[in-house]
């Protein structure tokens, strides 16, 4: 009689993480008598998946009843299988020895490989905020994919970005692989709408791309460009000077009066107006008494943007052509600007 | 799992044609489906495919000829002012369960014969 | 586009036999690459892919190996069932599109 064969006839096999694998394995002959063992890898470091005769692999079912005297299938199926289960998988035949069993023959093996999808890519940004013309970098990561190849793209409102720097870790072979991007975007006053997209294709993924997305909404800061102008009289000895704050972003903004260097009012922008670009204007205003003044007056508008230096305007009120009065009384008041964007 | 193709005949150069396939067994929002096909006696061409979520990507030598659109059941290949050399049988197919690298599945063609 | 080169065009074998087919691609595909066999009149039936896996049903005969840029199908215990025209299908992972070889026509004597 031929001696006994083990017939692996699968040379690989390809699962989807999570999916069951099914590793095949047939014996030509009966005798001799004894178990088979499936191990994963070769040589003195191998691991046992599975051992027919004791032991608990709860992972681990065998395709058909072993208990059956005349069975000659020893195929198993590997359930939620995870990229760390890849490998070469070999279904061995041992013949009942005393007092251990002995290995009698191996199949050729079969090496299984795991697909595995990646994560959602995650896109982060810097930790403050810049201003336009600022060259800013973000990062994107996602993992747990394999096989290796992956493409990883940037886009700036749909538009590619050519100046980023990409890794695949690990280098050599592994279960799994993560990949990390960094981009460099220029900043540009019209990006507060803007989104910046990492854009991953794997080939497990049946649909479009994964995104990850960040807004420069999170990154920008447009500083204010101020403007103090002199309104016409309102009333007698009454001077409306008024304090255009545009094109700021974000909203955060204090706005401080001052009258020849003494603070009048502080007031925080409230009811501001926004613009097409996604950036805000605001205007404040301030009703000054001129009788109250016996010499010229300065008026400053002093605005600090989302906790940065104040920036100022100054406007220089002439009273010399007014009836000086006893007594001070200076007023202001703010409202919300109802013109749109100029500029 | 079944692809079968339809709207395959017999037109004059320059006409359009749209070619539809009805898949039954599964779900096009969870593959990837593409179109191939294969002039009489030669070999098989890729024309594009569309992914699960309904975005088309065509060979670079389509050019805007062609066009892929799906509904829930049904996939089809939009093809504009047909020329003689678009004779052929138009294929769709699945792509694999495992990746978009492999096509399982496939529909038995339908033959278009552009000819005056 | 990737160009794949298959060959022979055509082959002759007997019954019993063995027959390689070869396969290359322009530039490396990273064993993203599936065997296909298409009797007249008939659709393509998937035999191999990922370079080397069986698909389910495919008789063990039919072997797919290789990486890089070279691939190989070899059927061996050649039966008459086996002739048709095989094609090889390349997918790229960059710009994920697909191209074939321009098949092998295996005749069995």
């Known amino acids: 009689e031929e001696e006994l064969q083990v017939i692996q006839p699968d040379k690989s096999v390809l699962v989807a993480a999570g999916e069951t694998a099914t590793l095949r394995c047939t014996a030509t002959s009966l005798i001799p008598v004894g178990p088979i063992q499936w191990f994963r890898g070769a040589g003195p470091g191998r691991e046992l998946i599975y051992n027919q005769k004791e032991g608990h692999f709860p992972r681990v079912t065998t395709v058909s009843d072993l208990t059956k005297r005349n069975n000659m299938d020893f195929s198993i199926r590997i359930g939620n299988i995870t990229p760390a289960d890849a490998g070469t998988y070999y279904c061995v035949k041992f013949r009942k020895g005393s007092p251990d069993d002995v290995e009698f023959k191996s199949g050729a093996g079969t090496e299984l490989s795991v697909r595995a999808k990646p994560s959602a890519p995650v896109v982060s940004g810097p930790a403050a905020r810049a201003t336009p013309q600022h060259t800013v970098s973000f990062t994107c990561e996602s993992h747990g994919f394999s096989p290796r190849d992956i493409t990883l793209k940037w886009f700036k409102n749909g538009n590619e970005l050519s100046d980023f720097q990409t890794n695949v870790d690990p280098v050599g072979e592994s279960v799994s692989y993560s990949i990390h991007s960094t981009a460099k975007v220029v900043l540009t006053r019209e990006d507060v709408h803007s989104q910046v997209i990492c854009e991953v294709a794997h080939v497990t993924l049946q649909g479009d791309p994964l995104r990850g997305t960040a807004n420069l909404s999170e990154t920008i800061r447009v500083p204010p460009t101020l403007e103090v102008t002199q309104q016409p009289v309102r009333a007698e000895n009454q001077v409306n000077v008024t304090c255009q704050v545009r094109k700021f972003y974000p909203q955060r903004l204090q706005l401080t009066w001052l009258e020849n260097g003494n603070v009048s009012r502080t007031e925080t922008a409230s009811t501001v107006t926004e613009n097409k670009d996604g950036t805000y204007n605001w205007m404040s205003w301030l009703l000054v008494n001129v009788s109250a003044h016996r010499d010229d007056v300065k008026l400053t508008c002093q605005v600090e943007h989302d906790g940065q230096p104040a920036v100022s305007k100054s406007h220089d009120l002439k009273v010399s052509a007014h009836p000086k009065e006893q007594g001070s009384n200076t007023a202001a008041e703010n409202t919300g600007s109802n013109e749109r964007n100029i500029y | 799992v079944q692809l079968v193709e339809s709207g395959g005949r017999l037109v004059q150069p320059g006409t359009p044609l749209t070619l539809s396939c009805t898949v039954s067994?599964?779900?096009?929002?969870?593959?990837?489906m593409g179109w191939f096909r294969q002039a009489p006696g030669k070999g098989l061409e890729y024309i594009g495919i569309?992914?699960?979520?309904?975005s088309p990507y065509y060979a670079s030598w389509v050019n805007g000829r062609f066009t892929i659109s799906k509904t829930s059941t049904t996939m089809d290949l939009k093809m504009n002012s047909l020329r003689s050399e678009d004779t052929a049988t138009y294929f769709c197919?699945?792509?694999?369960?495992?990746?978009?690298?492999?096509?399982?599945?496939w529909g038995p063609g339908t033959l278009v014969t552009v000819s005056s | 586009d990737i160009v794949m080169t298959q060959t022979p065009s055509s082959v002759e074998a007997a019954v019993g036999g063995t027959v390689t087919i070869k396969c290359q691609a322009g530039q490396s595909i990273n064993s993203y690459l599936a065997w296909y066999q298409q009797k007249p009149g008939q659709r393509p039936k998937l035999l191999i892919y990922y370079a080397s896996t069986l698909e389910s049903g495919v008789p063990s005969r039919f072997k797919g190996s290789g990486s890089g840029t070279d691939y190989t199908l070899t059927i061996s215990d050649l039966e008459s069932a086996d002739a048709a025209t095989y094609y090889c299908q390349s997918w790229h992972y960059i710009s994920r599109s697909y191209a074939f070889g321009g098949g092998t026509e295996v005749v069995v004597k």
């Open positions: 067994g599964f779900s096009l929002s969870s593959y990837v």
């Open positions: 197919a699945r792509v694999g369960p495992l990746g978009v690298d492999y096509f399982n599945i």
């Open positions: 569309i992914s699960s979520s309904g």
